[in-house]
């Protein structure tokens, strides 16, 4: 059996027989059996600074005599380099200084062998040495700088931020792992609640107006904060965030602008601005007009980029009507935080005063545009209707007239300068132009700077000035066996006039063709005739070709008639009336050619 | 021999929750961290937070608060991580790894797959 | 919070062949209590979890390979491999735990 000098034990074992025992820095409330072995744990402080090996146990067999005939051996993590043991006394030691921030935990195997025979003299036994914690490492910040937002005004304990630290010592064993958390600078500004590292407010009514940037120095310190903790340090950059606590206001109660009578709509004539301490979407400012008798006639628009309120021009301004309006100006915060509404009204206003200025204004015709109508066959120099323009201003200055050339450059129409009548120069023709687009110049005579210009629309009206004609140029075939009274061709006609009732056409026979005539035409009333065989059968070898006159006339007033030529040649034609030949020996002999007769 | 077995891989649908083990072996399970580590398809490795099995310790990578839980059981020395509320973009391995603090994850664990897919 | 870029992303070499890639910080990872950089190099093959290779900047994980070597300090961070070897083929991070913990984007070592 074994046994182990109590001197040497250091953690009071049972006294039990054992095969191989192991005294030292040993504790027995983890030891458990393995196989038949003892399993043992000894604690070895970490960072031993001594200047001798630091003694970890004592290895020892019951059959050691005391005459060096066995020898002791270790092997497994760190023997021979970490750990060392006298191989003749089993005492076993640490070589280095051990972190257990490195390896917490060291699994080695202990011998005892009989040096003759090689042989060991006892199985072989596992222990295991854990370093023990020493409070050897700072608490460090998770960031070197947090930075952080909460909104100014705000209520006191509001959390702002979460700093945590972490310490690398064993956090189950004593504090040297329990970190506390303290504030070094930022009071009475803010609080760390000690145990969480939740940054709070401490101070009721922290204005971003007044203060927007706060620097917090935090402390962590290990040992649960008590004396001899290490302690690390962190920075929290902490910004106030703005809320609506500003009312916006005017620096002045009274603005005037001058803007003359002549801005149209949409012109900008000043800018008014109140200002807003807060800032972003708190230092929003929507102006309208609130009262005043320039409320129609003038607007307020916002300028989003400079929060300016910009008087526009609502409708237009008449110096000879009134020269002065006065407004009244209202800024508001369209964000308001119904919180601080006991602040007061989130709004201010100012006075406007809008002088008009008188302004030597063009002549203006008495119609935007005009339309005027003219029969196409008026005579040169006929009027045809008249525009009138007038001086606005106060002076009412007397005004010529002149027709544009650019606008009618054939000079067709004219005007007189002075009572503004327009009258032709040329003759018009609607089948060549319907519509005549001119501008009318009205000039002040005694200042030609100062012009209008006004459109007129010309329409020329129809008059029934062109004859009718054939649609097409017609030229058709009659078969030899031909029946009396068959249809052979259609005849349509066009007319370039343009009648209000519509075209009327009525066609006939020429009264030289119309007597003993091989053809008849048949007059559809509707703009269309047709010309029938009027006998049964027509030899081509007597008669190739027939040209029938055609008179065409319309039915408006006055008639306009005239005359085309339909040519029907004879040709040879199957059973089916296909036509197969048409011998054109009536181009070359004229005696062949008839009209019809 | 030091061991760390992870649980086998996942298919989950989007939105959806997860929670896979890793079974430590051959030490002391609450002597060291165990951390935790994700690796998507073709990308590097991505830090999620470590857990002190002794006494319940946590620290989370911010990007995963509240997406990852790390807890333990020291009586069968196995971790645990739970991923909540799943996307796509939570498809990759998974790896535990035992370590101390300031040095380095001395041994790993095979890694879990995890595929969120609808 | 802090970043972590790593430079080349990729680059290939003959086996035999000294590599080098660094990592910056956007702040300092050195402790002056404990006089230690918190800077941890980590390997990770094509299909595989990945492998601690060193820690605190320079000190290698039992069983890396002498070859692969830390360097470095505040900002500024190295991996040297004095000779690449056809398993080094991989992706190389580096992670930093001085406030938490954060990755590199990595760094692809091809073989040619």
């Known amino acids: 059996t074994l046994s182990t000098p109590l001197s040497k034990r250091t953690s009071g074992f049972p006294a039990k027989k054992r095969a191989l025992e192991l005294s030292g820095n040993s504790k027995n409330e983890l030891s458990r059996s393995k196989r038949s072995w003892m399993w043992n744990q000894f604690f070895l402080l970490e960072e031993y600074t001594g200047s001798d090996y630091q003694y970890v146990g004592k290895l020892h067999s019951d059959q050691d005599r005391g005459d060096g005939s066995l020898k002791y051996i270790l092997s497994g993590d760190g023997a021979g380099d970490l750990f060392i043991i006298n191989e003749n006394t089993g005492d076993i030691q640490a070589t280095k200084r051990l972190d257990r921030e490195e390896k917490p935990v060291y699994i080695l195997r202990a011998q005892a062998i009989n040096r003759r025979t090689g042989r060991p003299v006892e199985p072989e036994s596992e222990f295991i040495i854990k370093i023990h914690d020493i409070n050897d490492n700072e608490p460090i910040f998770t960031k070197e700088v947090y930075t952080a937002t909460v909104p100014e005004m705000s209520d006191v304990g509001t959390f702002v931020v979460q700093v945590t630290a972490t310490d690398a010592d064993d956090p189950t064993y004593g504090n040297s792992a329990k970190v506390v958390y303290s504030i070094l600078q930022g009071q009475p500004y803010f609080s760390v609640e000690s145990e969480t590292g939740i940054i709070k407010t401490a101070l009721l009514n922290m204005d971003r107006e007044n203060r927007e940037q706060y620097q917090v120095v935090i402390q962590a310190k290990d040992m649960g904060g008590q004396m001899g903790g290490l302690s690390g340090t962190t920075t929290v950059n902490i910004t106030l965030t703005d809320v609506n606590d500003n009312p916006p206001r005017f620096p002045q109660s009274t603005y005037q602008f001058k803007t003359p009578e002549s801005s149209p709509p949409g012109t900008p004539i000043g800018r008014i601005k109140a200002s807003d301490a807060d800032v972003g979407e708190n230092a929003e400012i929507e102006y309208s007009i609130t009262d005043g008798e320039g409320l129609d006639m003038f607007d307020v628009i916002t300028d989003q980029e400079t929060q300016e309120g910009i008087i526009t021009v609502k409708k237009l301004l008449d110096f000879e009507k009134k020269k002065v309006y006065t407004l009244k100006v209202e800024a508001s915060n369209p964000h308001v935080e119904p919180r601080f509404l006991y602040l007061g009204p989130f709004k201010d206003s100012a006075t406007v005063r809008i002088v008009v200025e008188d302004v030597d204004e063009p002549p203006v015709f008495s119609k935007l545009a005009y339309i005027l109508q003219i029969r196409e066959d008026a005579q040169i120099n006929t009027t045809i209707g008249s525009v009138t323009a007038q001086d606005p201003d106060a002076a009412r200055n007397p005004v010529k007239y002149s027709v544009d050339r650019h606008t009618d450059m054939d000079r067709i129409f004219n005007i007189d300068s002075g009572n503004g009548s327009i009258f032709t120069s040329k003759l018009l023709d609607r089948e060549t132009l319907l519509w005549h687009n001119i501008t009318v110049i009205a000039t002040e005579i005694n200042n030609p700077k100062q012009s209008s210009r006004v459109p007129l629309y010309i329409k020329v009206l129809d008059v029934n000035d062109n004859a009718p004609e054939f649609a097409e140029f017609y030229e058709t075939f009659v078969c030899e066996k031909a029946k009396a009274d068959q249809l052979i061709q259609t005849l349509r006609a066009v007319d370039k006039d343009d009648p209000y009732s519509g075209h009327q056409f009525s066609f006939s026979l020429a009264p030289e063709a119309a007597s003993g005539s091989n053809f008849t035409i048949q007059d559809n009333k509707d703009n269309t005739a047709g010309i029938l065989t009027r006998k049964n059968g027509y030899n081509r070898h007597e008669m190739s070709t027939y040209l029938l006159p055609v008179v065409i006339s319309d039915n408006d007033y006055p008639v306009q008639s005239s005359t085309g030529t339909v040519t029907v040649r004879v040709c040879a034609c199957d059973h089916h009336g296909n036509m197969q030949s048409c011998h054109a020996e009536a181009l070359i002999h004229p005696t062949g050619l008839s009209t019809g007769a | 021999q030091v061991q760390l077995q992870q649980s086998g891989a996942e298919l989950v649908r989007p939105g959806t929750s997860v929670k896979m083990s890793c079974k430590a072996a051959?030490?002391?399970?609450?002597?060291?961290?165990i951390g935790w580590v994700k690796q998507r398809p073709g990308h590097g490795l991505e830090w999620i937070g470590d857990?002190?099995?002794?006494?319940?310790?946590?620290n989370y990578n911010e990007k995963f608060e509240g997406k990852a839980t790390l807890t333990a059981d020291t009586s069968s020395s196995t971790a645990y991580m739970q991923l909540s509320s799943l996307t796509s973009e939570d498809s990759a391995i998974y790896y535990c790894?035992?370590?101390?603090?300031?040095?380095?994850?001395?041994?790993w664990g095979q890694g879990t797959t995890l595929t969120v897919s609808s | 919070d802090i970043v972590m870029s790593q430079s080349p992303s990729s680059l290939a070499v003959s086996a035999g062949e000294k590599v080098t890639m660094s990592c910056k910080s956007s702040?300092?990872?050195?402790?002056?209590?404990?006089?230690?950089?918190?800077l941890a190099w980590y390997q990770q093959k094509p299909g595989q979890s990945p492998k601690l290779l060193i820690y605190?900047?320079?000190t290698r994980e039992s069983g890396v390979p002498d070859r692969f070597t830390g360097s470095g300090s505040g900002t500024d961070f190295t991996l040297t491999i004095s000779s690449v070897q056809a398993e080094d083929l991989a992706v190389y991070y580096c992670?930093?735990?001085?406030?938490?913990?954060?990755f590199g984007g990595g760094t692809k070592l091809e073989i040619k």
């Open positions: 605190w900047a320079s």
């Open positions: 992670k930093q735990s001085y406030y938490l913990r954060t």
């Open positions: 857990l002190y099995p002794g006494g319940d310790h946590a």
């Open positions: 702040q300092s990872l050195f402790n002056s209590r404990t006089r230690k950089n918190y």
């Open positions: 790894a035992r370590g101390m603090l300031t040095t380095g994850f001395d041994s």
């Open positions: 051959e030490y002391t399970f609450t002597n060291y961290w």
